[in-house]
Amino acid sequence: EPPTACREKQYLINSQCCSLCQPGQKLVSDCTEFTETECLPCGESEFLDTWNRETHCHQHKYCDPNLGLRVQQKGTSETDTICTCEEGWHCTSEACESCVLHRSCSPGFGVKQIATGVSDTICEPCPVGFFSNVSSAFEKCHPWTSCETKDLVVQQAGTNKTDVVCGPQDRLR
């Protein structure tokens, strides 16, 4: 695309190129042949994050505690507030408009990736040689106990939900 009649950080209005307002400011009046563009800073709890010709600033996002949200980063005149979720909860979308409780991994499954404020717990089935006997959002699959290292023998085989049961070796008579 060839360049347009007005340069970057300018806009075309009534046959002239006016300067855009910088981030954090809104347009009060367009430039004329004799005057510059007039801009005003955004008010408290407002922002504009681009060079713009907006006549109203945007309201900062509200992190509603009733939806499990809290402020991760306070907004400025140039940036929106960033919300995240309370401990034990995660965002339901990229915009983080509400939160849901982290899921727990059922017995037979372990935590592959612990949940964050923006992503849920990722579970994986415990492979052979590993087990999980609890429902947890933190516990990984644990390896079965090694009876041999304790000079014991397996009395009951392990499963993905239970550890092996070790017992003493039969004594030769």
């Epitope: 046959s15 190129c17 042949e33």
Partner: antibody, heavy 116, light 107 residues
Framework: QVQLVQSGAEVKKPGASVKVSCKAS????????IEWVRQAPGQGLEWIGV????????NYNEKFKGRATLTADKSISTAYMELSRLRSDDTAVYFC?????????WGQGTLVTVSS | DIQMTQSPSSLSASVGDRVTITCRAS??????LNWYQQKPGKAVKLLIS???RLHSGVPSRFSGSGSGTDYTLTISSLQPEDFATYFC?????????FGQGTKVEIK
């Protein structure tokens, strides 16, 4: 005083191109946009496009995109409007105008007649 | 594109009359409305820019008003040299568009 002097009348055949010039004087040529407008016989005004003579940036009316080409030569304070693939309904008076707040100053117009 | 509807398309008036021409835009044009005068064989003249700003050298009998979509050009006391065609034009959104014109004739 500000003056925009356009080239003389042209008669063209359908399918041909025409290039109209607009020589500016009395102000800083690169400080203002140059607008192009046409007026068919007995009709209203129709905007063609605008050029920034300072660096050649342009905006066109979608209707003329691909057929109209706006250029400017800073060294001689002259803007040009070329219209290609002419049709009989392109018969009109073509105007250049200096921007500012609105089309502040106008050329006298150039009659382009398209006829076989 | 923004449509500009000008009325009346023509009017007959006498010297000294007060004349009003209106222009309606198909959407809000934020006061970016200009008025022009065209006489046969003469260069088009800008009369008023941005709704109400009189262009340099234009007599004060010409005035403009309006907002949003509705705008008015008023000639307070028509003079012989004012018999001409008048156009409105919006400069808010590309492509710039014009009204169809109002021809002011001698009664």
């Amino acid at each position: 005083q500000v003056q925009l002097v356009q080239s003389g009348a042209e008669v063209k055949k359908p399918g041909a191109s025409v290039k109209v010039s607009c020589k500016a004087s009395g102000y800083g040529f690169t400080n203002y946009l140059i607008e192009w407008v046409r007026q068919a016989p007995g009709q209203g005004l129709e905007w063609i496009g605008v050029i920034n003579p300072g660096y050649g940036g342009v905006n066109y009316n979608e209707k003329f995109k691909g057929r109209a080409t706006l250029t400017a030569d800073k060294s001689i304070s002259t803007a040009y409007m070329e219209l290609s693939r002419l049709r009989s309904d392109d018969t009109a008076v073509y105007f250049c105008a200096r921007g500012g707040s609105g089309f502040a100053f106008w050329g006298q117009g150039t009659l382009v007649t398209v006829s076989s | 594109d923004i449509q500009m509807t000008q009325s009346p398309s023509s009017l007959s008036a006498s010297v000294g009359d007060r004349v009003t021409i209106t222009c309606r835009a198909s959407q809000d044009i934020s006061n970016h409305l200009n008025w022009y005068q065209q006489k046969p064989g003469k260069a088009v003249k800008l009369l008023i820019s941005s709704t109400s700003r009189l262009h340099s050298g234009v007599p004060s009998r010409f005035s403009g008003s309006g907002s949003g979509t509705d705008y008015t050009l008023t000639i307070s006391s028509l003079q012989p040299e004012d018999f001409a065609t008048y156009f409105c034009q919006q400069g808010n959104t590309l492509p710039w568009t014009f009204g169809q014109g109002t021809k002011v004739e001698i009664k």
